[in-house]
């Protein structure tokens, strides 16, 4: 439950559009060891690509790209009866406002691929 | 390349710790139709759970929980020779500072499960 039950939610229409944000991240080291090897051990393995943009915070975001169109079976062969697909998530990033070296940012939505999963294809019946 | 090549990166130590942020989201509707049915069609299917916190922005985040320990095979049976595991991602959220109805926020890191993937288990040989 909210600490301040009478406060407007930040998503409310009447909430101020500009707020102060402290960049000292809380939980900075929470689970920072999460670089697991799932990307290699998955039946829908993926590669990780570095997406860097100095005008954005965070400036580095890692994006997943599925290695295969199909999925890897128990023998290590690619089975095209199944498909590797990216799991995507919308995240919020801070985009520097386009005035020279300003300390003003704007929230921006980004769709990132986090990893891949193996799905049964949609079977389309042609009439 | 950056618009302002001489500007300090927002991750630099000498960057101001408090910045102004405009909450009018850019790319608000980017790919907003992405609610795919992968969670059902995956060999490592998952359920989506709503995580709500009015002191956070965004206040609602959906978290994935893998349905099975194993993975679903072509016949729809759970195969325990493989494991369903959550794909996790660190995201940034805004946490309202604990002063009554303040317009001050702090960046907070959250580890969220976005979906699940099917992996070969690590076999540990006991000496």
């Amino acid at each position: 439950s909210p600490q301040n039950p009478g406060c407007p939610n930040a998503e409310d229409k009447n909430f101020p559009r500009t707020v102060m944000v402290n960049l000292n991240i809380r939980n900075r080291n929470t689970n920072s060891k999460r670089a697991s090897d799932y990307y290699n051990r998955s039946s829908s393995p993926w590669n990780l690509h570095r997406n860097e943009d100095p005008e954005r915070y965070p400036s580095v975001i890692w994006e997943a790209k599925c290695r295969h169109l199909g999925c890897v079976d128990a023998d290590g062969n690619v089975d095209y009866h199944m498909n590797s697909v990216p799991i995507q998530q919308e995240i919020l990033v801070l985009r520097r406002e386009p005035r020279h070296c300003t300390n003003s940012f704007r929230l921006e939505k980004m769709l990132v691929s986090v990893g891949c999963t193996c799905v049964t294809p949609i079977v389309r019946h042609v009439a | 390349s950056p618009q302002n090549p001489g500007c300090p990166n927002a991750e630099d130590k000498n960057f101001p710790r408090t910045v102004m942020v405009n909450l009018n989201i850019r790319n608000r509707n980017t790919n907003s139709k992405r609610a795919s049915d992968y969670y059902n069609r995956s060999s490592s299917p998952w359920n989506l759970h709503r995580n709500e916190d009015p002191e956070r922005y965004p206040s609602v985040i959906w978290e994935a929980k893998c349905r099975h320990l194993g993975c679903v095979d072509a016949d729809g049976n759970v195969d325990y020779h493989m494991n369903s595991v959550p794909i996790q991602q660190e995201i940034l959220v805004l946490r309202r500072e604990p002063r009554h109805c303040t317009n001050s926020f702090r960046l907070e890191k959250m580890l969220v499960s976005v979906g699940c993937t099917c992996v070969t288990p690590i076999v540990r040989h006991v000496a």
Partner: nanobody, 125 residues
Framework: EVQLVESGGRLVQAGGSLRLPCAAS????????MGWFRQAPGKEREFVAA????????AYADFVRGRFTISRDDARNTVYLHMTSLKPEDTAVYYC??????????????????WGQGTQVTVSS
Amino acid sequence: EVQLVESGGRLVQAGGSLRLPCAASGRTFTSYPMGWFRQAPGKEREFVAAISMSGDDAAYADFVRGRFTISRDDARNTVYLHMTSLKPEDTAVYYCAARTSYDGTYDYIDDYSYWGQGTQVTVSS
């Protein structure tokens, strides 16, 4: 938005080879699988080949497997279809296609949102 421009199509003798480049402009090129389709006169457009986002894997229609190879060069924003052992039945307009969604199939035409104008390949006997 992605613009696709195919080139490299021409008249070639049976048994010959061709390489068709497809140049893409737009930021989404590297984000999703790309595909090649073809349409012969009086026939429906059909899947030829597709390549994964990472470029590590490709899938082919049975009728070109072993003869055609798809590849991508993300630095050049280009996808290639390398065609060998060409047959007269390979005569068609070849289209490059990009997808902006990925819904668990790679050979279904409707999954591809962006198309080039096509390049004509004619194989004479």
